[in-house]
Interface confidence: low
C-alpha cells in the first residue's frame, strides 16, 4: 500500500520506477486539479511528508524521449 519515502529511499524508488527516463524533484507536468497535494510542491513534500503511491511517483518521471529518426 501507499507509504512515505524520504531521502535515499525516495531516490531509489524513483530510479526503479522511472528507469532510463530519469526523474525530477519539482512539480510534475500535467498535474490535474483533482490532485490531493498542492500544485507547486515537489516530490519531497508529496511523498516524504505525506503518504505516496506508485502512480504519484510515476508523475515525476521525465517524459519518454522520442526515437531518433534514421
Amino acid at each position: 500500500g501507499p507509504e512515505t519515502l524520504c531521502g535515499a529511499e525516495l531516490v531509489d524508488a524513483l530510479q526503479f520506477v522511472c528507469g532510463d527516463r530519469g526523474f525530477y524533484f519539482n512539480k510534475p507536468t500535467g498535474y490535474g486539479s483533482s490532485s490531493r497535494r498542492a500544485p507547486q510542491t515537489g516530490i519531497v513534500d508529496e511523498c516524504c511528508f505525506r503518504s505516496c503511491d506508485l502512480r504519484r511517483l510515476e508523475m515525476y518521471c521525465a517524459p519518454l524521449k522520442p526515437a531518433k529518426s534514421a
Epitope: P2, E3, T4, A38, S51
Partner: antibody, heavy 120, light 112 residues
Framework: QVQLVQSGAEVKKPGASVKVSCKAS????????INWVRQATGQGLEWMGW????????GYAQKFQGRVTMTRNTSISTAYMELSSLRSEDTAVYYC?????????????WGQGTTVTVSS | QSVLTQPPSVSAAPGQKVTISCSGS????????VSWYQQLPGTAPKLLIY???KRPSGIPDRFSGSKSGTSATLGITGLQTGDEADYYC????????????FGGGTKLTVLG
C-alpha cells in the same frame, strides 16, 4: 456504522504524559490516515499531526514535535496519541479524525473527543 | 493566531443567506483543497464541504463552498436555528512548517 470511539477523560499533573486511544470500526482501518486535533475550552481547532495506519509513518505539527507520538495497533484497529511533558495549556479536548490518504476528502469521521485536564 | 483568517462572528435571520470568508495565502488556500467543518455546541466537528465545493452525502445543498485565489467562502442559504454553530475552514499549508491548518472559527448566530 463507521465510527471512531475514543478513550475516557484524563486528569494529569504537569510534567506527566497522557495516552489517548481511538478505536476504528465499520471501515478498513489501514485505508485512512488518522489525524489528531485538539481544542482548548472556548478556542478553535488545532491540528497536531497525522499517522498512516498502514505503514505507521507519521507527520507532526512543528509545535508538537518532540512531545507527541502517534502509534497504532492494526490488530485491534486502534490509534494512539501520546503527549508528554504536559503543561496547563495542554488542557483541551483531543479528537481523532480519519481521512483517506489516496485522495483529498477532508476529515469525514471524528471521534467523540477526549477531555484531558492538566492540573497540579 | 491562525494561519487562515475568518471573521469571529456573523449573524442573520432565519430563512436568510449568510457567507463566511476564509483568507489565506499561496502556500495554503490558493494551491490546496479547502474543507469546511460545522461544530455544534458540545459536539465534535462535522465535515460540511471538501475539495473546495463538494458536499459529503447527507449534507443538504443549502451549504456550498467556493474558492478564488487565496480566499475561500462558505455559503449557507435558508438559514435554520439548527445552523447556529461554529464554522471552521481547513486546508494544507505547504510552507516550511507544512501541515494542516484551521481558520480561527466563525460563530454563526441565527437571529430571532
Amino acid at each position: 456504522q463507521v465510527q471512531l470511539v475514543q478513550s475516557g477523560a484524563e486528569v494529569k499533573k504537569p510534567g506527566a504524559s497522557v495516552k489517548v486511544s481511538c478505536k476504528a470500526s465499520g471501515y478498513t482501518f489501514t485505508s485512512y490516515d488518522i489525524n489528531w486535533v485538539r481544542q482548548a475550552t472556548g478556542q478553535g481547532l488545532e491540528w497536531m499531526g497525522w499517522m498512516n495506519p498502514n505503514s505507521g509513518n507519521t507527520g507532526y505539527a512543528q509545535k508538537f514535535q518532540g512531545r507527541v507520538t502517534m502509534t497504532r495497533n492494526t490488530s485491534i484497529s486502534t490509534a494512539y496519541m501520546e503527549l508528554s511533558s504536559l503543561r496547563s495549556e495542554d488542557t483541551a479536548v483531543y479528537y481523532c479524525a480519519r481521512d483517506p490518504y489516496y485522495y483529498y476528502y477532508g476529515m469525514d469521521v471524528w471521534g467523540q473527543g477526549t477531555t484531558v485536564t492538566v492540573s497540579s | 493566531q491562525s494561519v487562515l483568517t475568518q471573521p469571529p462572528s456573523v449573524s442573520a435571520a432565519p430563512g436568510q443567506k449568510v457567507t463566511i470568508s476564509c483568507s489565506g495565502s499561496s502556500s495554503n488556500i490558493e494551491n490546496n483543497h479547502v474543507s469546511w467543518y460545522q461544530q455544534l455546541p458540545g459536539t465534535a466537528p462535522k465535515l460540511l464541504i471538501y475539495d473546495n465545493n463538494k458536499r459529503p452525502s447527507g449534507i443538504p445543498d443549502r451549504f456550498s463552498g467556493s474558492k478564488s485565489g487565496t480566499s475561500a467562502t462558505l455559503g449557507i442559504t435558508g438559514l435554520q436555528t439548527g445552523d447556529e454553530a461554529d464554522y471552521y475552514c481547513e486546508t494544507w499549508d505547504t510552507s516550511l512548517s507544512a501541515g494542516r491548518v484551521f481558520g480561527g472559527g466563525t460563530k454563526l448566530t441565527v437571529l430571532g
